[in-house]
């Protein structure tokens, strides 16, 4: 049925769009760049992404439309709302702070949340990260009892150990939490790269021809027997 | 075998300066962190300052009470450890050992020690 | 800075006598500790290094032992010429800290 199929009879994808037949007389325009609708027969108004702040782009007939995200409006969704025009989003007389595509209640001291409409308990709940122990120094203050290794108003850092470490033996820091922790050359393991690897238990062979392997601190001999001689005895 | 001998010491009037040096021997100087020491006559060990190794890209640390006023470097094609010492106090006066940290937290090979008088 | 506490700062004891000094340190610092064995006019000796270990050469009349923030050094059977002061010293992170010290006289 190809030549009586409309994809050929009637041409119907227009600016160089591609006609593909689905069935004996339904077919889909894949369209160029630059085109759209279901004929190509459109310009992509959307191809030179005109809707702002993260709004969403669709073509009619020639025409974009842009679907705004919430706090934002105008045609290209260029124009933050202003939250704050509107009264009585902030309780207990917080500020309304207006914010791209949002807004932001700073609270009078005794209230907190979004809308300022909760009672501010300096511990409940705790502001103390990473373990630390809040404890409510006034009726509007507190303070963080950090566990070792962090530090902050909240105990937010993570305190950096490395600036004293003795990572041994060419091993290189890497911070822990209140410790530290080093990175071994291949000679040598454990935290601080005070242990020294077995290279005769690593490598069985590492030794040619009959000789024994003898482990040394930081590397390994071979003793060469027969006449053999060199690092692996191989000479 | 492994040796480390100091000099440099002397008397030396309060805020004034001297420059202590210790050369190393039977041992790769670079691959090794090197510590200086000192002790009070009857007193014990206290610990001034170190240069980490090669690997550790020869960072250095101070003792609080000489930070600012000595300088430890090395100079590793005359395996040699320094320790520049300005705007000296009384209670600097001690006998300076210098060190090698064997690798395995021990500080396996010491100086004869050199000792360091500051008076007036 | 991590603190050292060294006990006791003196002991009289008779040859082949055990004598044990312990070093007690304010944080972990992960078996990080030496013992060094000093006598008058002298440079202090490594006796014992990662708390445990015996440095090459040194009589194994010598141990350590401990973990965490507890050391002990141990001398089994005194002898004549173990008569000096001892040092503990951490190693794990600097300021490296030393013992105040532990002399072990002649009873």
């Known amino acids: 049925y190809s030549t009586s199929h409309p994809c050929f009879v009637s041409r119907p994808c227009l600016n160089g769009g591609t006609c593909h037949m689905l069935s004996r007389d339904t077919y889909e325009c894949t369209c160029q760049v630059g085109f759209t609708g279901k004929e190509c027969q459109w310009t992509d108004a959307c191809l030179s992404h005109p809707c702002a702040n993260g709004s969403t782009c669709t073509t009619v007939a020639n025409q974009f439309s842009c679907k705004c995200l919430t706090g934002f409006t105008g045609q290209k969704c260029e124009t933050d709302v202003n939250e704050c025009d509107i009264p009585g989003h902030c309780q207990h007389g917080g500020t309304c702070l207006n914010l791209p595509g949002s807004y932001q209640c700073q609270c009078p001291q005794g209230f907190t949340g979004q809308y300022c409409d909760s009672l501010y308990v300096p511990c409940a709940p705790s502001p103390c990260v990473n373990g630390g122990t809040c404890r409510q120094t006034g009726d509007f203050t507190f303070e963080c009892n950090c566990l070792p290794g962090f530090e902050g108003s909240t105990c937010e850092r993570n305190i950096d150990d490395c600036p004293n470490h003795r990572c041994q033996n060419g091993g290189v820091c890497v911070d822990g939490v209140n410790t530290y922790n080093c990175r071994c050359p291949p000679q040598w393991t454990g935290q601080f790269c005070t242990e020294d690897v077995d290279e005769c238990l690593l490598q069985p062979n590492a030794c040619q021809n009959g000789g024994t392997c003898a482990n040394r601190n930081g590397g390994y001999g071979c003793v060469c027997v027969n006449g053999w001689s060199g690092d692996d005895c191989s000479e | 075998e492994v040796q480390l001998v100091e000099s440099g010491g002397g008397l030396v009037q309060p805020g004034g300066s001297l420059k202590l040096s210790c050369a190393v021997s039977?041992?790769?100087?670079?691959?090794?962190?090197m510590e200086w020491v000192r002790q009070a006559s009857g007193k014990g060990l206290e610990w001034v300052a170190a240069?980490?190794?090669?690997?550790?890209?020869?960072?250095?640390v101070y003792s609080a009470s000489v930070k600012d006023r000595f300088t430890i470097s090395r100079d590793d094609s005359k395996s040699t450890l320094y320790l520049q010492m300005n705007s000296l106090k009384t209670e600097d006066t001690a006998v300076y050992y210098c060190?090698?940290?064997?690798?395995?937290?021990?500080?396996?090979?010491w100086g004869q020690g050199t000792l360091v008088t500051v008076s007036s | 800075d991590i603190q050292m506490t060294q006990s006791p700062s003196s002991v009289s004891a008779s040859v082949g006598d055990r004598v044990t000094i312990t070093c007690q340190t304010s944080?972990?610092?992960?078996?990080?500790l030496a013992w060094y064995q000093q006598k008058p006019g002298k440079s202090p000796k490594l006796l014992i290094y990662?708390?445990?270990r015996l440095q090459d050469g040194v009589p194994s009349r010598f141990s350590g032992s401990g973990s965490g923030t507890d050391y002990t050094l141990t001398i089994s059977s005194l002898q004549p010429e173990d008569f000096a002061t001892y040092y503990c010293?951490?190693?794990?992170?600097?300021?490296?800290?030393f013992g105040g010290g532990t002399k072990v006289e002649i009873k």
């Open positions: 039977g041992f790769t100087f670079s691959d090794f962190y």
């Open positions: 990662g708390a445990s």
């Open positions: 010293q951490q190693g794990f992170k600097y300021p490296l800290t």
């Open positions: 944080e972990d610092i992960y078996s990080g």
């Open positions: 060190s090698r940290d064997g690798g395995k937290w021990g500080l396996d090979a």
């Open positions: 240069q980490r190794n090669k690997a550790n890209d020869f960072s250095i």
